[in-house]
């Protein structure tokens, strides 16, 4: 039951995280005009990964897309790439994890396959979360650098004649959404990896042992590990030494290397 809960919770947390990463990537408020210690303007500037916007006091908002690709700063391109990679990995991870969920039955898929899929999706979520955190952090670092550069030079001369107020930008809401979302995706991924350990058998399954009452011969029957309907069916390493015949399912266990008949 604990494994199911961990896997389910990991999936939900990752789902929320990836939704947050997508939201952050699409948001326009990656950087917003710094209003502290600035001349009070009747326009408010903010920028995203894909476009920059200006909200006027009149209530009108005008957004312009970055239609150039080559003219954009390399750092912005890198952030875009990191966020997209994060989204793609996260989306694939979600798809994989849906089939890996123990509560969903797909044909006769074995638990070992589900365990592998859970681990795969977990790793994908971890990488996705790291990509988002890295992307947001790179952008934040870029902002901090530019902020102090513009603070040192609040008023820049345009052609030595015109005094233009340098617009300083600070952290926008998207950065915080991205950090939180990346963190959630990372946590979800870790939870999936933990759940994988509970799903997978500790060792390769040996053949089930079957005793027959009629004689003293020992029969080794093929059987292997069968997928059970319950989550973590808590089968202990118990031996049955009575002479009665047992079905494979009854004696199904995880034998250790030293379990000899």
């Amino acid at each position: 039951m604990a494994v199911t809960a961990c896997q389910g919770l990991g999936f939900v947390v990752s789902l929320i995280g990836i939704a947050g990463i997508i939201a952050a990537t699409c948001m326009d408020q990656w950087s917003t005009q710094d209003l502290y210690n600035n001349p009070v303007t009747a326009v408010f500037n903010y920028q995203g990964l894909w476009r920059s916007c200006v909200r006027e006091s009149s209530g009108f908002t005008e957004c312009r897309g970055y239609f150039t690709l080559l003219g954009l700063p390399a750092m912005l391109q890198a952030v875009r790439a990191l966020m997209i990679v994060g989204i793609v990995l996260g989306a694939i991870g979600l798809l994989v994890s849906i089939f890996a969920l123990k509560c969903i039955r797909i044909g006769s898929m074995e638990d070992s396959a589900k365990a592998n899929m859970t681990l795969t999706s977990g790793i994908m979520f971890i990488v996705s979360g790291l990509c988002a955190i890295a992307g947001v952090s790179v952008f934040a670092n870029m902002l901090v650098t530019n902020f102090w550069m513009s603070t040192a030079n609040m008023y820049t001369g345009m052609g030595g004649m015109v005094q233009t107020v340098q617009t300083r930008y600070t952290f926008g809401a998207a950065l915080f959404v991205g950090w939180v979302a990346g963190g959630l995706t990372l946590i979800g991924g870790v939870m999936m990896c933990i759940a994988c350990r509970g799903l997978a058998p500790e060792e390769t399954n040996y053949k089930a042992v079957s005793y027959h009452a009629s004689g003293h011969s020992v029969a080794y029957k093929p059987g292997g590990f069968k997928a059970s309907t319950g989550f973590g069916s808590n089968t202990k390493n118990k031996k049955i030494y009575d002479g009665g015949a047992r079905t494979e399912d009854e004696v199904q266990s995880y034998p250790s290397k030293h379990d000899y008949v």
Epitope: Q33, P39, V40, T41, A42, V43, N45, Y46, Q47, S52, C53, V54, E56, S57, S58, G59, F60, E62, R64, M158, V162, Q163, T164, V165, Q166, T167
Partner: antibody, heavy 118, light 113 residues
Framework: QVQLQQSGAELVKPGTSVKLSCKAS????????LNWVRQRPKQGLEWIGW????????NYNEKFQGQATLTTDKSSSTAYMQLSRLTSEDSAVYFC???????????WGQGTLVTVSA | DIVMTQSPSSLTVTAGEKVTMSCKSS????????????LTWYQQKPGRPPKLLIY???TRESGVPDRFTGSGSGTDFTLTISSVQAEDLAVYYC?????????FGAGTKLEIK
């Protein structure tokens, strides 16, 4: 069509208050901000402040802070400006005007003449 | 506060003539976010409220004759009337729409001979 209808002329005594109204019609009242502008006799224009009827958000020119109070009544699509502690210097025509692109003012009321005299 | 200086304070022209009037601001009205200049031009005829002519320094309001042209950037702006008509007799004001408080120039009075 868009119209801003302002209240009639006022003759008031120094030290008293006056409340001017500006009734909007022909557009969604809560969507656009309304500005108030003063024009003293034979003088230029002075911006007093603006109010957004939608959320009641206001912004005042510091010069008029404390003296002018902007309010709206959404049910009647009317904006109000209360002027307190009036002096002869406040004798002017007061306009209400609607915000537009570039923070410009594209529709204006006809103006209300306020005369402050003992 | 941002000071808007208009010149000349008045000018007299004959109908059909080209007129230019200037407006200078004490600080740049150019917004780096959208590269627009937040300057507006109004026309006020005697006994009437002001009428919007130009916003964003050069965008003509709909219904305004194309003889009115706004130009300039940063701190220096110009309103040009290519061929003055008798009905253009008015006071022309420029307004800073970028910094609070939003300030107006003292106006340029246009008179027709």
């Amino acid at each position: 069509q868009v119209q801003l209808q302002q209240s009639g002329a006022e003759l008031v005594k120094p030290g008293t208050s006056v409340k001017l109204s500006c009734k909007a019609s022909g557009y969604s009242f809560t969507t656009y901000g309304l500005n108030w502008v003063r024009q003293r006799p034979k003088q230029g224009l002075e911006w007093i402040g603006w109010i957004f009827p939608g959320d009641g958000n206001v912004n005042y020119n510091e010069k008029f802070q404390g003296q002018a109070t902007l309010t709206t009544d959404k049910s009647s699509s009317t904006a109000y400006m209360q002027l307190s502690r009036l002096t002869s210097e406040d004798s002017a025509v007061y306009f209400c005007a609607r915000f537009y692109y570039g923070n410009s003012l594209n529709y204006w009321g006809q103006g209300t003449l306020v005369t402050v005299s003992a | 506060d941002i000071v808007m200086t208009q010149s000349p304070s008045s000018l007299t022209v004959t109908a059909g003539e080209k007129v230019t009037m200037s407006c200078k601001s004490s600080q740049s009205l150019l917004n780096s976010g959208n590269l627009r200049n937040y300057l507006t031009w109004y026309q006020q005829k005697p006994g009437r409220p002001p009428k919007l002519l130009i916003y964003w320094a050069s965008t003509r309001e709909s219904g305004v004759p194309d003889r009115f042209t706004g130009s300039g950037s940063g701190t220096d702006f110009t309103l040009t009337i290519s061929s003055v008509q008798a009905e253009d007799l008015a006071v022309y004001y420029c307004q800073n729409n970028y910094f609070y408080p939003l300030t107006f120039g003292a106006g340029t009075k246009l008179e027709i001979k």
